[in-house]
Interface confidence: low
Amino acid sequence: YKLVCYYTSWSQYREGDGSCFPDALDRFLCTHIIYSFANISNDHIDTWEWNDVTLYGMLNTLKNRNPNLKTLLSVGGWNFGSQRFSKIASNTQSRRTFIKSVPPFLRTHGFDGLDLAWLYPGRRDKQHFTTLIKEMKAEFIKEAQPGKKQLLLSAALSAGKVTIDSSYDIAKISQHLDFISIMTYDFHGAWRGTTGHHSPLFRGQEDASPDRFSNTDYAVGYMLRLGAPASKLVMGIPTFGRSFTLASSETGVGAPISGPGIPGRFTKEAGTLAYYEICDFLRGATVHRILGQQVPYATKGNQWVGYDDQESVKSKVQYLKDRQLAGAMVWALDLDDFQGSFCGQDLRFPLTNAIKDALAAT
């Protein structure tokens, strides 16, 4: 099985024990590590952070001791902007320029492939996204002709039904991608006005959402139905939780909220907590399991957080094995307890290790 793990370059800027550089990663933990994110400047792939080149080097030296490890560079992301991607993909010249710029950039910096993180193609971009993938793959095949190892091509896709329907021609893009990471998290957010788990495995009786689509099982099943081969589908598992501020004394699933949860000490983003911050939060908190959804949540005071733990990730891995998927994807290594100092297990990357162990179990 594949274990595809994202690393985010901006994690270097977190304070103190939250700061994560690629040299802190475990070279034997994942089969693939994806560095997020690269930029596109003047239609050419480019660095984003001032020190990206240094960090690329740090990451790719991990392969010296584990030649089986593959590294990919992810281009795009939330801050890149969908319209910018649309501009490049929809214009033949821009697209060609971008595609041509990718192989030399990846080779120069020691990456084994490219991950496309267009978040998200609009309703009019579906065809352009397909064309971009098809032409990128053709370029990778051509570039590898002189006997080089062919560069890998993957894409991170939304798990939301509305986005899947409007953005992706699943059957077509699947033909050209080496694997597809489906982002089976962020199903529930503060916009709903109630508590709810952002990455439930199943819908469950507890789901107060207005639809039946907001769960991992539906998203995976839907992708398969649309023509994604199970052998290329990698299922996303988050090492972060989504938190809410409760608006009343109710604390269960579907309880009213006044907004996102208070920012974590290190990640400093309202409504989001890294797993290592959750381990801190759990001291003195009340933990519940949402039985039907097979995921936990915890409450403390007026704070509510839905997250994944070692038990829930094992359930998810069992599920992806039952579905005969290609493996698991983790967002993100730097949100796991990468130092092993927060979660009291004296183990670095406890969630990702639990996923790895479950994948390896017979």
Epitope: Q83, N91, Y120, D211
Partner: antibody, heavy 119, light 111 residues
Framework: QIQLVQSGPELKKPGETVKISCKAS????????MHWVKQTPGKGLKWMVW????????TYADDFKGRFAFSLETSASTAYLQINNLKNEDTATYFC????????????WGQGTLVTVSA | DIVLTQSPASLAVSLGQRATISCRAS??????????MHWYQQKPGQPPKLLIY???NLESGVPARFSGSGSGTDFTLNIHPVEEEDAATYYC?????????FGGGTKLEIK
């Protein structure tokens, strides 16, 4: 700050052509879609078109196919609405509006341009 | 096309009381996680002003006395307590699919 400034009121005769403008400032014009909305006197609002500001490609509501032309001058961060062969029922205030984000409603509006068609 | 029907067409509410405006869609405007319904306030001679986006999110700078709720086909805008300056016409609008459409409007009068 972000502003959409529209051209002034127009008085036209039936059969004539009018072209109104919407100049955007305070943001990168090609980063956000632009829309036009029609409001007839004392009546409600009617969505007319969505324009991809990067490609210039318009997507029309059925009622606004034919006599209506939408264009962009990207270098001037300006969107245009042209109505050909004007009819009395085109008398209305036309607003340009910018999407807040993906599908999140129109947070920025032009002040509106009143087009009066009268013989 | 999705038709949005607002009710009532007009209402008069006393200062400090609650105003409730409904918007019914001819088919669901909700999808995975989002309800693509927005509410606007319009005063004479002015463009509409976004109050609530994605059914329940308060636009920045809009007073907390405005709130939105609903999913699927039924949505509500509540104003409580109503103030003098709230006299205006209110519109719902969906962005679920093209063409985007507006409701017919509700005129709010303050007694």
């Amino acid at each position: 700050q972000i502003q959409l400034v529209q051209s002034g009121p127009e008085l036209k005769k039936p059969g004539e052509t009018v072209k109104i403008s919407c100049k955007a400032s305070g943001y990168t014009f090609t980063d956000y879609s632009m829309h036009w909305v029609k409001q007839t006197p004392g009546k409600g609002l009617k969505w007319m078109v969505w324009i991809n500001t990067e490609t210039g490609e318009p997507t029309y509501a059925d009622d606004f196919k034919g006599r209506f032309a939408f264009s962009l001058e990207t270098s001037a961060s300006t969107a245009y609405l042209q109505i050909n062969n004007l009819k009395n029922e085109d008398t209305a205030t036309y607003f340009c509006a910018r999407e807040y984000g993906n599908y999140e409603g129109f947070v920025y509006w032009g002040q509106g341009t009143l087009v009066t068609v009268s013989a | 096309d999705i038709v949005l029907t607002q009710s009532p067409a007009s209402l008069a509410v006393s200062l400090g009381q609650r105003a409730t405006i409904s918007c019914r869609a001819s088919k669901s405007v909700s999808t995975s996680g989002y309800s693509y319904m927005h509410w606007y306030q319009q005063k004479p001679g002015q463009p509409p002003k976004l109050l609530i986006y994605l059914a329940s999110n308060l636009e920045s700078g809009v007073p907390a006395r405005f709130s939105g709720s609903g999913s699927g086909t039924d949505f509500t805008l509540n104003i409580h307590p109503v103030e003098e300056e709230d006299a205006a016409t209110y519109y719902c609008q969906h962005s679920r699919e093209l063409p985007w459409t507006f409701g017919g409007g509700t005129k709010l009068e303050i007694k």
